[in-house]
Structure formats: structure tokens, C-alpha cells
Interface confidence: medium
């Protein structure tokens, strides 16, 4: 489980000293600097007790792995869930406080109750003001339960939760009718996914037997250790006022662990540290108790005297939880309570133990989870014990569980279990990502999400050229960091791996997958520049430059014109992918528009140096369209146009421009000027016989205008093949008789 | 002694509204819950609504959801039911009774009749 | 919601004859159930509650028994006055809905 612990300080005298602490032993945990290690989160969660709101809390960081909460104005702040989460990935847990009022109308007689599934959950709210009301039971904030104040037994109300299964785990509270919620018993439902004793996917596994209150988890199967015990079953008591899983952390203040509430994973939920009880945890526990709320018996043997926060405290010649086992007897010495190996490793493991008589060699064997017994392949003999050594097979995941080292000798036997994890190196489930590169060089993100086991102690980044056969260069990083691969050939692509480790022998994983990754092109270093522009309409511009003459080939694929529009804040970018062009039409702009022009040279996705920028101003867009065009056939070769001048003009008409097609025609259209402005009749010229002809036209100020609409006409009968057509202008007064 | 005395029953159109109050003495009746019950012409007893104590708390069946509410004044020792929206099926005769321990009534009244129908 | 079932809708019997009335709940109810007689033109009066407790006033030879969903309420010996109308009631503790039974009519026979 996660060493995670939630501190409550229930000296509740004055809401301004409370406070709660969340204290994590995880290495590395809340640095939230980078993906291997979030950050510690502590905070109240009013999605089921809502209270009034008041100013902020505080939340004060210390070191890397405790958050404090304060700030608590008034009573009322303290009432309700807090949670802190911590652990990372997969590990991420959530530990949940629940504080009642003091002063409430009805108080939990227990607020955690944890339970297996199946189980009949009672809770039991003490009626500490009586309000003749109903009483109303909440699960998770919704209403399902009401008792009616007569049904107070010995001044309780019970709640009895027949067969409870998992989704029943949550928060419960019993609220007298019209008052006030914060009077309420809040209690905390945790509900095991196994029966008694069992843990695993289909509840297969038997739980190691967890002593001094602990709590076998029900997806691990370890032990959750009340505060103040740690080891593999909880055997081993923490020196007074100590506490985490491996009595690491140390309670604050002069009166050690009183007055404060620990909070722990689930299953194990709430209680008071070792030796304290009492609904504010200030009682020491009473002559023959000791451990977690003082809920455990010591009832030694052989002058053995009870200690409250470790238990027995036995006599010389005397150990064992109730001092019942002689010192005669064969005594397993400082085995670790949890071993941790990589898959497909062969690791030695020693056993220790001491006894009279003395254990040889062939008195000491380990048994593995399937039952099998390994026999020592070697023991080294001192004079207070014998250590065996032992070569364990190659290691499999089903290895994974609780081991045991068994002595056996005349005096008679001991065994301790330990706990062994076998832990799958980690391999990349992604390639690295490429985050920029250069013509040179590759920057690479080399964290990746993986399976197996962390944590991460060391990443590997592998890379050599696409479809090469020459060995893979390595370089060593700091997962947390990106990489640099430098000395790289232009142009080329690399293939990337990353190789993840973890600690111990073995924890190299298997290479992740490959991605191809290319260096970039040459940098083109030509700085263009413009050798000239014109305006070839109100929307059209022709540019054209020049690059300076260098020896060797061209470095480069094309140019990159920009226009920039200052007054609308818009870039317009036109690609000439031609390395030879010095020339292009830049069409579609538009009219009346100041425009900044640059052009640069680019090698695949590099840019050059821009050449000097130019200003251009294009002219405004034209006059409106001429209107009621009219074509009609004069003869064989001629037809005369008619149309009346555009309205609302904006200045005076320099000329007016038509457009000649032959309908159906495949060919480029024909545009003759009408450079008399007043004009509205011309006659077109030189068109063929009996052909159809589509015919527009549009007026010009300082730039063309829009076009009319399209009339069509056709020629007369039995011409001769004309030159071309022609144009003469008259106006519309004249000839339209002849 | 417990007396419970209801009023305000009456001929009414469907769609129309009716006000029932119920006078009750002879015990404390701030410290009670307060249910109203009725029962149709030849046929069996049906609850129709329930208020707590002060008064912040009411339930109602679902056939008269939305339509009956039910109040009560502690200062005057009365218990009311505001109905809207009558519809021929609520022509019963309304009954008050005080809820006694475990939420059974243990005293009703006499009952006022409520017809509606055009 | 809980339907209350009574039975039988009416039970002929002569004075000094045993009444056994029938409640069966269509979902378990514990033990929270009332037993009442109506007689005609009169309000209801509660006799039994909690299943098998007997009200204030009411005579011994009213009695009733069951749990969870069979209910009955026994009459040992009928007095004149016992004919009337029964009708049983639960109360569910969530919602907190109040449910009667059909009624059960015990008449002379």
C-alpha cells in the first residue's frame, strides 16, 4: 500500500489550531515537477457535507512530502471530508478524514467501520442532544433511511447494512429531522472486496494474517498497519510516538501522538495512534490495552508486562506476542519483512536464527507461495546464529506473495513470513517523441508511458542511422528532462529507442519501439532581395528578385513570398516552389491595400534569411458595372454594342474594356479597349459569319472595375473568314438606323 | 382528550380549489407530525400527505403531487390542505389524524367530505 | 412503491367465533405495520402497531403477529361490536410513503 497518513490535530479547544497534515513516505513523493512524482493534494471536499462558506484555507508545503491545511475560523469549518491523495500512477490513492462536531445533536459511537464484503455493518449514532424528531439516515448525501425518535435504543439510533457489498462503501450520516446538518453523526462505510481473510481479482488468495489490527487489503493482499506497527503483518511496534510504514515519521509536539487522528488507505480508514483512544484520541489506554484506539489485549505471560503503544514486553529468556515462547525455542532473527526482486532474476536470499540447540544448515528451509521448499545451499555459523543462504530458481511473477523461512530444531520450531515482490521491468509502450530538430541535431522527449513496474532509475535513449548495421549509440538521461542528440549527419534519418530501468539486478527492460526521426536539411543562407514589383490590376501584383552568385549548387527549394497587411493585421504567404524562379504573380489581393513584401529562400522546412522588406500600395478597386448591355448584329462581321455608364461613380471613367469570346470557344478570350469614356455604342469588327459570341464589359477609374453582364450575339450569314475583331466607338445616338 | 375537527369540505368543480383546515386540542400539538387521509366513497383508506413537526418537512403521494399542500400554524393548533386542481377522483372524505409513535395514526377526526364534479 | 394485500376481501363468522385476517406486504416491511377497524360512518381507529404491539384501550383479544411480509391479525372470540372493516397499514422508512391494505370486511354471518 502506499505510505500515506492524513493527521488530524483534535485539540478542538480553538478551530483556529486545528489542522490537518498529509505526510507521505513514498520516495519522491509530491516534487510535482515532473511525471514520475505528482504533488500531494489535501483538501476539504464538500461534494457530500456542504458547510458555510468561509475565508480559504491555507495550504503550506513542507519539504517534498508533507502539505498542512489551516486557516479554520470557526467550529463549523472543521466539519465534513477532508481527503489528501498522493502516489503516483497506478499508485495514486485517496485517504479520507471524517470530523464531527463536537457539539452535534447525535455522535458516531465509531466513525470508521471497515468491513467485508458480505458483512452486516452496524453504525451506531449516540444521541448526544435528544430532539423528539426522526431521525434520517444519508448514504453518500441521498436520503434511503428514516427511524422515528421512539426507536432510540439505550439513547442510539442503529443502522443495521445486511450483506454490504462494495458500491455500499461511503460516506453515512444520521441527522436529526429539521436540524441543522452540521449536528449530524457523520460515519465512514469502507466495505473489503473479499470475505474475511481473502484478497485478489476473484477473492482466491488467503490474506497473510495481519496482527495488531492490521488490515489485509484486499487487491494486494499486504497488510495495512495501524499507526504506530510496521512489518509484513504488523509484528513489529514502532518506537513511541513514531508512525509510516516504516516508523519514519515522528508525531509533533511535546505529548507525542495524543490528540491526533491518523487516517490510512483504505481498508484500514481512521483511528488514533498507538495508545490513545477516546473520540478525541486524549485518552491513554486503560491497564491491559495497548495499539490503535487501545482496541487490543495484551494478556502476557511468564512476567511479561504490558506496554500501551508496542504491547508485551517480555522478560529475559521469553519473546512472542504474549511472551509464550522461550528463548529456547528456535527464533527466526531480522528478516526483512518484504523483499523485492526483477522478473527472471536468481537471487540469494538469507535466513538467520539462533536457538539452543543450535540450528545447523539443514534445520533452515524457505518455502515459496506454491508450497515448494528450497533447502540452503550454503550456511555461515556464528556464535549467536546460524545464517542460510539461498539460491532461489529464476524468479516468475506467481513468486510474487508471502514466503517463509522455517527453522526446526529439537527445542522446537519458529517461522516468519515475508513478503516477496517480483516486479516486472518496465518497457516503453511508445516511442519517444520528437520535439524539434536541426540539420545537426535532435531534441527528444524521452518519457513515455510504460508496463511493468517503476519506479524509473534509469532511461536509456538508443539511435542510429535508418538501415544502418553499425552499433547503436547510447546516451544515459534524466528521465525528467529532455534530450539532446547531437553530431548528427544532415538529412538523414535516425531510428530512436528508449530502454527503461528500474533498481535491483535485472530491472533493464526489453527496448521499446522505434520511431524514425530526420535530421534537417542544410539551413539555406541566401538572403534574397527585390528587384522590382508592378501593379497588374487593383488585386494582382508581379514580383520579381534576385539571390547573390555563390559557387556550388543552390541550397534550396523555393521562395517564400509574404505580404503583410498592417491595417487588418493579416499575413498572406505564397509558395514558389521552383528554386529557379525569380518571378511570380501574386493574385486575389486586396484592393486599396499598403502592403510590407519579403522574400526568402527555404530548403525543406528551413527558412533563409528574409530579403529587405518593400512597401506597395495597391491601387483601390475599380468603378461599378456598366449597365443594360445590348449586343446586336450589324452583318457578317460586325456587331454593335450598347450599354449605359455605371452608376454611382467614384471619379471619372478613364476607358471602358471588352471582352470578346467565341461562345463554346476554347481559346484565351479578347479584351478591346474603349479609350473614349463618354462613349456608350461601339462596333466590334472583323468577327466571323455566323458565329456566336458572348460579350462583357467593365469601366475603368484608377483600376478596373466589375464586369457587366454577359450578352450574346451572333453574326450574320455568309462572310468571308475576317482578320480579327475590331472595335470602332461612336455614340449610341448615331448610326443605331443604318 | 384528543380532538381533531375538520372543515372547509364542499361541492367544487373540476379544476377548482378547496381549503381543508383541522382544529386539534387536547395535547401539544407543536411536538406532533400531522397526516391528512382520505377515503372514497365505498372504498378503502388512502394517505394522501404528511408534515413534520415544524413544518419544514412534507411528503405527499403521488396522485396528488404537485397539486395538495399541505401546512400547519403551531400558533393556532391547526392543520391545513390546500387543494388545487380537483379532479373528480379526489371526492373522498377527508380525514386528519396525529402520528403517533412509529408513524401510525393514533387519532383521527370525523372526517369532511370533498365532491368534486360539474 | 409497497402494495399491501388483504385477505379475504370479506370473512363471514358468527359472535364468539376466531377472526384470522390476512396483510401480506409485496416487499419486506420489518416489522413496521398497523392494524385498524373502521366502522361505518366513523373514523378509523388504530389497534395494533409495530405488527403485534396493542394500542391504548384495546382489548386483549385483539392480537397481532408476523414479520416482513406476512402479517395477521386475530380476533380470538367476536364480540357484536367487532364487525366492521380492517385495514392494515405500513410505513416504509424510505421513502417515508404510508400504504393501506384493500381492507378485509368481517360481517355476521
Known amino acids: 500500500a502506499v505510505d500515506l497518513t492524513l493527521l488530524a490535530n483534535l485539540r478542538l479547544t480553538d478551530p483556529q489550531r486545528f489542522f490537518l497534515t498529509c505526510v507521505s513516505g513514498e520516495a519522491g513523493a509530491g516534487r510535482g515537477s515532473d511525471a514520475w512524482g505528482p504533488p500531494l493534494l489535501l483538501e476539504k471536499d464538500d461534494r457530500i457535507v456542504r458547510t458555510p462558506p468561509g475565508p480559504p484555507l491555507r495550504l503550506a508545503r513542507n519539504g517534498s512530502h508533507q502539505v498542512t491545511l489551516r486557516g479554520f475560523s470557526k467550529p463549523s469549518d472543521l466539519v465534513g471530508v477532508f481527503s489528501c491523495v498522493g502516489g503516483a500512477g497506478a499508485r495514486r490513492t485517496r485517504v479520507i478524514y471524517v470530523h464531527n462536531s463536537p457539539g452535534a445533536h447525535l455522535l458516531p459511537d465509531k466513525v470508521t467501520h471497515t468491513v467485508n464484503k458480505g458483512d452486516t455493518a452496524v453504525l451506531s449514532a449516540r444521541v448526544h442532544k435528544e430532539k423528539q424528531t426522526d431521525v434520517i439516515w444519508k448514504s453518500n448525501g441521498s436520503y434511503f433511511y428514516t427511524l422515528d425518535w421512539h426507536e432510540a435504543q439505550d439513547g442510539r439510533f442503529l443502522l443495521q447494512l445486511p450483506n454490504v457489498q462494495p458500491p455500499s462503501s461511503g460516506i453515512y450520516s444520521a441527522t436529526y429531522l429539521e436540524a441543522s446538518p452540521l449536528g449530524s453523526a457523520f460515519f465512514r462505510l469502507i466495505v473489503r472486496g473479499c470475505g474475511a481473510g481473502r484478497w485478489g481479482p476473484g477473492c482466491t488468495k488467503e490474506c497473510p494474517g495481519c496482527l495488531h489490527g492490521g488490515v489485509c487489503h484486499d487487491h494486494d493482499g499486504e497488510c495495512v498497519c495501524p499507526p504506530g506497527f510496521t512489518g509484513t503483518r504488523c509484528e513489529q511496534a514502532c518506537r513511541e510516538g513514531r508512525f509510516g510504514q516504516s516508523c519514519q515519521e515522528q508525531c509533533p509536539g511535546i505529548s507525542g501522538c495524543r490528540g491526533l487522528t491518523f487516517c490510512l488507505p483504505d481498508p484500514y480508514g481512521c483511528s488514533c495512534g498507538s495508545g490513545w483512544r477516546g473520540s478525541q484520541c486524549q485518552e491513554a489506554c486503560a491497564p491491559g490495552h495497548f495499539g490503535a484506539d487501545c482496541r487490543l489485549q495484551c494478556q502476557c505471560q511468564n512476567g511479561g508486562t504490558c506496554d500501551r503503544f508496542s504491547g508485551c514486553v517480555c522478560p529475559s529468556g521469553w519473546h512472542g506476542v504474549h511472551c509464550e515462547k522461550s528463548d529456547r525455542i528456535p527464533q527466526i532473527l531480522n528478516m526483512a519483512s518484504e523483499l523485492e526482486f526483477n522478473l527472471e532474476t536468481m537471487p540469494r536470499i538469507n535466513c538467520a536464527a539462533a536457538g539452543n540447540p543450535f540450528p545447523v544448515r539443514g534445520s533452515i528451509e524457505l518455502r515459496k507461495p506454491d508450497g515448494t521448499v528450497l533447502l540452503s545451499t550454503k550456511a555461515i555459523v556464528e556464535p549467536e546464529k546460524t545464517t542460510a543462504e539461498f539460491e532461489v530458481p529464476r524468479l516468475v511473477l506467481a513468486d510474487s506473495g508471502f514466503w517463509e523461512c522455517r527453522v526446526s530444531t529439537s527445542g522446537g520450531q519458529d517461522s516468519r513470513r515475508f513478503k516477496v515482490n517480483v516486479k516486472v521491468p518496465p518497457v516503453p509502450l511508445a516511442a519517444p517523441r520528437l520535439l524539434t530538430k536541426q540539420s545537426r541535431q535532435l531534441v527528444v522527449s524521452p518519457l513515455v508511458s510504460f508496463s511493468g513496474d517503476g519506479p524509473i532509475s534509469t532511461v536509456r535513449l538508443h539511435y542510429r542511422p535508418q538501415d544502418s548495421t553499425m552499433d547503436w549509440s547510447t546516451i544515459v538521461v534524466d528521465p525528467s528532462e529532455n534530450v539532446t542528440l547531437m553530431n548528427l549527419r544532415p538529412k538523414t534519418g535516425y531510428s530512436v529507442r528508449v530502454q527503461l530501468s528500474r533498481p535491483g539486478e535485472g530491472g533493464e527492460g526489453a527496448w521499446g519501439p522505434p520511431t524514425l526521426m530526420t535530421t534537417d536539411c542544410p539551413e539555406p543562407l541566401l538572403q534574397p532581395w527585390l528587384e522590382g514589383w508592378h501593379v497588374e490590376g487593383t488585386d494582382r501584383l508581379r514580383v520579381s528578385w534576385s539571390l547573390p552568385l555563390v559557387p556550388g549548387p543552390l541550397v534550396g527549394d523555393g521562395f517564400l513570398l509574404r505580404l503583410w497587411d498592417g491595417t487588418r493585421g493579416q499575413e498572406r504567404r505564397e509558395n514558389v516552389s521552383s528554386p529557379q524562379a525569380r518571378t511570380a504573380l501574386l493574385t486575389g489581393l486586396t484592393p486599396g491595400t499598403h502592403y510590407q513584401l519579403d522574400v526568402q529562400l527555404y530548403h525543406c522546412t528551413l527558412l533563409g534569411p528574409a530579403s529587405p522588406p518593400a512597401h506597395v500600395l495597391l491601387p483601390p478597386s475599380g468603378p461599378p458595372a456598366p449597365r443594360h448591355l445590348h449586343a446586336q448584329a450589324l452583318s457578317d462581321s460586325e456587331i454593335q454594342l450598347t450599354w449605359k455608364h455605371p452608376e454611382a461613380l467614384p471619379g471619372p471613367i478613364s476607358k471602358y474594356v471588352v471582352e470578346v469570346q467565341v461562345a463554346g470557344g476554347a481559346g484565351d478570350p479578347l479584351w478591346i479597349d474603349v479609350d473614349r469614356p463618354e462613349e456608350t455604342s461601339t462596333i466590334i469588327r472583323g468577327l466571323n459569319a455566323s458565329t456566336r459570341y458572348l460579350f462583357r464589359m467593365r469601366a475603368s477609374i484608377q483600376g478596373l472595375g466589375d464586369w457587366s453582364n454577359t450578352v450574346e450575339e451572333s453574326t450574320l450569314g455568309n462572310g468571308l473568314q475576317a482578320e480579327g475583331p475590331v472595335q470602332e466607338s461612336r455614340a449610341a445616338e448615331e448610326g443605331l438606323d443604318q | 382528550e384528543v380532538q381533531l375537527l375538520e372543515s372547509g369540505g364542499g361541492l367544487v368543480q373540476p379544476g377548482g380549489s378547496l381549503r381543508l383546515s383541522c382544529a386539534a386540542s387536547?395535547?401539544?400539538?407543536?411536538?406532533?407530525?400531522m397526516e391528512w387521509v382520505r377515503q372514497a366513497p365505498g372504498k378503502g383508506l388512502e394517505w394522501v400527505s404528511s408534515?413534520?413537526?415544524?413544518?419544514?418537512?412534507?411528503y405527499y403521494a403521488d396522485s396528488v403531487k404537485g397539486r395538495f399542500t399541505i401546512s400547519r400554524d403551531n400558533s393556532k393548533n391547526t392543520l391545513y390542505l390546500q387543494m388545487n386542481s380537483l379532479r373528480a377522483e379526489d371526492t373522498a372524505v377527508y380525514y386528519c389524524?396525529?402520528?403517533?409513535?412509529?408513524?401510525?395514526?393514533?387519532?383521527w377526526g370525523q372526517g369532511t367530505l370533498v365532491t368534486v364534479s360539474s | 412503491d409497497i402494495q399491501m394485500i388483504q385477505s379475504p376481501a370479506t370473512l363471514s363468522l358468527s359472535p364468539g367465533e376466531r377472526a384470522t385476517l390476512s396483510c401480506r406486504a409485496s416487499?419486506?416491511?420489518?416489522?413496521?405495520l398497523a392494524w385498524y377497524q373502521q366502522k361505518p360512518g366513523q373514523a378509523p381507529r388504530l389497534l395494533i402497531y409495530d405488527a403485534s404491539n396493542r394500542a391504548t384501550g384495546i382489548p386483549a383479544r385483539f392480537s397481532g403477529s408476523g414479520s416482513g411480509t406476512d402479517f395477521t391479525l386475530t380476533i380470538s372470540s367476536l364480540e357484536p361490536e367487532d364487525f366492521a372493516v380492517y385495514y392494515c397499514?405500513?410505513?416504509?422508512?424510505?421513502?417515508?410513503?404510508?400504504?393501506f391494505g384493500g381492507g378485509t370486511k368481517v360481517e355476521i354471518k
Open positions: 416487499q419486506s416491511v420489518s416489522s413496521y
Open positions: 397499514q405500513q410505513r416504509s422508512n424510505w421513502p417515508p410513503a404510508l400504504t
Open positions: 389524524a396525529r402520528r403517533g409513535s412509529g408513524r401510525y395514526f393514533d387519532y
Open positions: 387536547g395535547f401539544t400539538f407543536s411536538r406532533y407530525g
Open positions: 408534515i413534520y413537526p415544524s413544518g419544514g418537512w412534507t
